[in-house]
């Protein structure tokens, strides 16, 4: 099956202090390689979450990524701050035998728009 990374929401709005879910699903787990979430693109992009076991404060996976055939790589960001605003990308990599992993597909991106906390 052809690999497609889908981020169904173009944008989400969230009040500062609240949490938000960023959805991402894959049509295939092949080729073998990790899935990572970034904010921004190019040289300035920031790694937000990696489904490879590291700990990321305030960011958690929504479903159990270790489950066999799990295609859901959505994440939850808690206690959102204005600094979290930006466009988030779910990116699939192909594992390299010795060289670094190769980025092969990305979702279309989901903008996180942070609203002022209601007073």
């Amino acid at each position: 099956k052809e690999l497609k990374v889908t981020q169904p929401e173009k944008s989400v709005s969230v009040a500062a202090g609240d949490s938000t879910v960023l959805n991402c699903t894959l049509t295939s787990l092949l080729p073998v390689g990790p899935i990572k979430w970034y904010r921004g693109v190019g040289q300035s992009r920031l790694l937000i979450y990696s489904f490879t076991g590291e700990h990321f404060p305030r960011v958690t996976n929504v479903s159990d990524a270790t489950k066999r055939n799990n295609m859901d790589f959505s994440i939850r960001i808690s206690n959102v701050t204005p600094e979290d605003a930006g466009t988030y990308y779910c990116v699939k990599f192909q594992k390299g035998p010795s060289e670094p992993d190769t980025e092969i597909q990305s979702g279309g991106g989901t903008e996180v728009y942070v609203l002022a906390k209601p007073s």
Epitope: S11, T87, G108
Partner: antibody, heavy 119, light 108 residues
Amino acid sequence: DVQLVESGGGVVRPGESLRLSCAASGFTFSSYDMNWVRQAPGEGLEWVSLISGSGEIIYYADSVKGRFTISRDNSKNTLYLQMNSLRAEDTAVYYCAKENNRYRFFDYWGLGTLVTVSS
Amino acid sequence: KTVLTQSPGTLSLSPGERATLTCRADQSVYTYLAWYQERPGQAPRLLIYDASSRATGIPDRFSGSGSGTEFTLTISSLQSEDFAVYYCQQYYDRPPLTFGGGTKVEIK
């Protein structure tokens, strides 16, 4: 049939204001994000601003930030662009554009309205 | 922001000929790219989205290809109504949404 009809263009002096309108029909207006795109004489297309269907999410190009305000009235199926502190470089045809529901490209455009800023 | 560069700036061809327009991005936009046609006095029209999908009602002489940083719009056999200006637009890196500078297809 989708129709977008812009109005409100005209000739103004630098520093003055103008409000553009875009009357939409043929689709469920409140369900779609809407944009303003402009084209200066002899130049290419430049994205100006976008507003989400609910009006909650708004973005501007750096060139107009702090001077232009996008808004919408879903009960009237109308998109607006309030343009303050106009400059000569704002002279352009302003197009209203309906976004696709999946991604941020434009599946329908209006004919545009010409704004001329001249002393 | 992602910069799109279109080439050539002007393409002079005769009706019936094949037109090949190029759009290059300064960083990968995967296949998140659209093409538009703009004729004088008319609203811009969406031709291609997702780099290669034809929009509703667009004749099959228009086709798009490419991914990453290099994209092509091909018009297989130019008709009189195809002489116009063509723009590419990326919707991956946003905001802002960015357009290429345009390619004018004119009658030779």
